[in-house]
């Protein structure tokens, strides 16, 4: 079958990194600069992706493979193949259309991306707040109040954080 196909279609003999040039009697011509073909038998080469501005080059384009981009520091990749770059924020913030904004009281974000999430409600699990939540950290739940009967040893909570707060009860 392969022999038959190559007799019928001379383009099938053109390897990756070349294209079947109709203007030159279907000769296999190398891809021009800034273009590539990742499979054989192609009649055109694809233009290389340009990584500029918010994007930076992770892997250069070659005659057989496209360039790969990531994001300039201060931004992070979104989408398949890093199709978009999105702004980083600080911990304790979330990204909005107005830029990075502090998490509202009762919520936290411990990453440079993503949204602020509500503090854990310790009482739902029958537990008490051992360490207060902050904009950057969730509350730490401790033993249930019943476990802290008189005489039982309890953990001394650390000093309050910058913006102390209890889980919404």
């Amino acid at each position: 079958f392969e022999r038959t196909r190559s007799l019928q279609d001379p383009c099938s003999n053109c390897p990756a990194g070349t294209f079947c040039d109709n203007n030159r009697n279907q000769i296999c011509s190398p891809c021009p600069p800034n273009s590539f073909s990742s499979a054989g038998g192609q009649r055109t080469c694809d233009i290389c992706r340009q990584c500029k501005g918010v994007f930076r080059t992770r892997k250069e384009c070659s005659s057989t493979s496209n360039a790969e981009c990531d994001c300039t520091p201060g931004f992070h990749c979104l989408g398949a193949g890093c199709s978009m770059c999105e702004q980083d924020c600080k911990q304790g913030q979330e990204l909005t259309k107005k830029g990075c904004k502090d998490c509202c009281f009762g919520t936290f974000n411990d990453q440079k991306r993503g949204i602020c999430r509500p503090w854990t409600n310790c009482s739902l699990d029958g537990k008490s707040v051992l360490v207060n939540g902050t904009k950057e950290r969730d509350v730490v739940c401790g033993p249930s109040p019943a476990d802290l009967s008189p005489g039982a040893s309890s953990v001394t909570p650390p000093a309050p954080a910058r913006e102390p707060g209890h889980s919404p009860q």
Partner: nanobody, 123 residues
Framework: QVQLQESGGGLVQPGGSLRLSCAAT?????NYWMNWVRQAPGKGLEW???????????YYVDSVKGRFTISRGNAKNSLYLQMSSLRAEDTAVYFC????????????????SGQGTTVTVSS
């Protein structure tokens, strides 16, 4: 081919003004949120301002509020950044960038940006 090309950068004294332009080709600017971002020497990329499709929403990073104005000339398929009361800390390469599909709803990702134009504020 979808492209953005910035222009208008240069050397300006502290307190001076500049107007940056960004010309879009290969797509209709009025269909997208548009942004300006900048990169100061040796620093990471910083978001500066954005504007929605019809220009009714405009937002700025705190450090430029009251000094910079983002605008769009949809008829010319162009984006602008008017910069006044410039400071040394505004020295950077400025890029215009397009908000990707779903910007402001699912994400705040930028999918196309230009090569940048350099602004130097120095006496």
């Amino acid at each position: 081919q979808v492209q953005l090309q910035e222009s208008g950068g240069g050397l300006v004294q502290p307190g001076g003004s500049l107007r940056l332009s960004c010309a879009a080709t290969g797509f209709t600017l009025s269909n997208y949120w548009m942004n300006w971002v900048r990169q100061a020497p040796g620093k990471g990329l910083e978001w500066v301002a954005n504007i929605n499709q019809d220009g009714s929403e405009r937002y700025y990073v705190d450090s430029v509020k009251g000094r910079f104005t983002i605008s769009r000339g949809n008829a010319k398929n162009s984006l602008y950044l008017q910069m006044s009361s410039l400071r040394a800390e505004d020295t950077a390469v400025y890029f215009c960038a397009r908000g990707g599909e779903g910007y402001g709803v699912d994400h705040y990702g930028l999918d196309v940006s230009g090569q940048g134009t350099t602004v130097t504020v120095s006496s």
